[in-house]
Interface confidence: low
């Protein structure tokens, strides 16, 4: 597969992953009530996210409440907020870096420097995926630990919500996309003769040493 194709595929995966990460960050379904034996309130489900909690009745009526105070939030929610928002913003930065390093753009002149910019974009996406993975796994670990903790009352036990699964899928896309971008950039830096069209100018005159002027070669 050509470097341009790797670049395009990598960027598409990263963009989809970025969208998934934004969705996971905003959804109030990081944890959902686990119906272990019965409904604590007849036919009612509770969803909890990073920004709000929702109560869904069996009728389909949903009532959501945005968390009032940041200080009242648990450490894990505050940390998850900070890390996921950082990952989303970093992915935004990575997008511009990747576009600048893309072969189809003219932000940076073709050459090793451009390939290095593209490589940086790929690495940023990889780091972005890892950064998002931390709160997702941390949060999941807490949910699972509390689920099996006998000191947590049965009605307060939660299961992993859809947002966590979306988040994991998004991080996988970001990391795979980042790897593809890195591979595309690697091809460029490793094989410059094939990656970039080189215009040769006609030799003017031999130098005093009889060699051709080095500037005629990339």
């Amino acid at each position: 597969m050509g470097s341009a194709a790797l670049e395009i595929l990598g960027l598409v995966l990263c963009l989809v992953g970025w969208g998934g990460l934004i969705l996971a960050c905003g959804l109030p379904m990081w944890q959902v009530t686990a119906f272990l034996d019965h409904n604590i309130v007849t036919a009612q489900t509770t969803w909890k996210g990073l920004w709000m909690s929702c109560v869904v009745q069996s009728t389909g009526h949903m009532q959501c409440k945005v968390y009032d105070s940041v200080l009242a939030l648990s450490t894990e929610v505050q940390a998850a907020r900070a890390l996921t928002v950082s990952a989303v913003l970093l992915a935004f930065v990575a997008l511009f870096v990747t576009l600048a390093g893309a072969q189809c753009t003219t932000c940076v002149a073709p050459g090793p420097a451009k390939a290095r910019v593209a490589l940086t974009g790929g690495v940023l996406y990889l780091f972005c995926g890892l950064l998002a993975l931390v709160p997702l796994c941390w949060f999941a670990n807490i949910v699972v630990r509390e689920f099996y903790d006998p000191s947590v009352p049965v009605s307060q036990k939660y299961e992993l919500g859809a947002a966590l699964y979306i988040g994991w899928a998004a991080t996988a896309l970001l990391m795979v996309g980042g790897c593809l971008l890195c591979c595309g950039a690697w091809v460029c830096t490793g094989r410059p003769d094939l990656s970039f069209p080189v215009k040769y100018s006609a030799p003017r005159r031999p130098t005093a040493t009889g060699d051709y002027d080095k500037k005629n070669y990339v």
């Epitope: 119906f35 272990l36 034996d37 604590i40 006998p150 000191s151 009352p153 049965v154 009605s155």
Partner: antibody, heavy 120, light 112 residues
Framework: EVQLVESGGGLVQPKGSLKLSCAAS????????MHWVRQAPGKGLEWVAR??????????YYVDSVKDRFIISRDDSQSMLYLQVNNLKTEDTAMYYC???????????WGQGTTLTVSS | DIVMSQSPSSLPVSVGQKVTMTCKSS????????????LAWYQQKPGQSPKLLIY???TRESGVPDRFTGSGSGTDFTLTISSVKAEDLAIYYC????????FGGGTRLEIK
């Protein structure tokens, strides 16, 4: 109307065994956790065992004094709750109640009880 | 394990009198996430099985007369009967359902 009817109690010798049964009706048995609670003559209530629903893999819990001797089980298709009591001791003599863990985690419905007497 | 202690063990009262019985737990029954106390009160009349009166420490079960009131939080709880009736003759048990299930020793309400 919710009904819990216990049966199977009787006179047993120490180290003996017995199986207590509870027939449930009037509610969706398979989604509720069920318990056995006992009451020794003239004494207070003591929680004995709990079994959760199928969605919780029928997880079981016991009070320390009956662990390894009593086995709680259920048959959702028949809406039946059971307590297999083995290696009985005289201190196991009590009225055994079948109890439903209700929507608020506490015990909202109780059976009338079945008497288990352990004596030589 | 959580240990539940009830006092008094016996409570002689007259019809129409207001009575209060207490229940103490060895550890807090308040779950901070939902601000609920995992404590229930049961009534057991002579020759009958227990009946749920109060859950979440202060919420009356449907059908329970409003003369029964539960209060308290954390480790200290009370059950108050505002005006005792002859039919209230029973043993009253508190129960924690925060971690597994433990009952108090009971308070016997006796009519003078």
């Amino acid at each position: 109307e919710v009904q819990l009817v216990e049966s199977g109690g009787g006179l047993v010798q120490p180290k003996g065994s017995l199986k207590l049964s509870c027939a449930a009706s009037g509610f969706t048995f398979n989604i509720y956790a069920m318990h056995w609670v006992r009451q020794a003559p003239g004494k207070g209530l003591e929680w004995v065992a709990r079994i959760r629903s199928k969605s919780s893999n029928y997880a079981t819990y016991y009070v320390d004094s009956v662990k390894d001797r009593f086995i709680i089980s259920r048959d959702d298709s028949q809406s039946m709750l059971y307590l297999q009591v083995n290696n009985l001791k005289t201190e196991d003599t009590a009225m055994y109640y079948c109890v439903r863990e209700g929507n608020w985690d506490c015990f909202d419905y109780w059976g009338q009880g079945t008497t288990l007497t352990v004596s030589s | 394990d959580i240990v539940m202690s009830q006092s008094p063990s016996s409570l002689p009262v007259s019809v129409g009198q207001k009575v209060t019985m207490t229940c103490k737990s060895s550890q807090s029954l308040l779950y901070t996430s939902n601000q609920k106390n995992y404590l229930a009160w049961y009534q057991q009349k002579p020759g009958q099985s227990p009946k749920l009166l109060i859950y979440w420490a202060s919420t009356r079960e449907s059908g329970v007369p409003d003369r029964f009131t539960g209060s308290g939080s954390g480790t200290d709880f009370t059950l108050t009967i505002s005006s005792v009736k002859a039919e209230d003759l029973a043993i009253y048990y508190c129960q924690q359902y925060y971690r597994y299930h433990t009952f108090g020793g009971g308070t016997r309400l006796e009519i003078k």
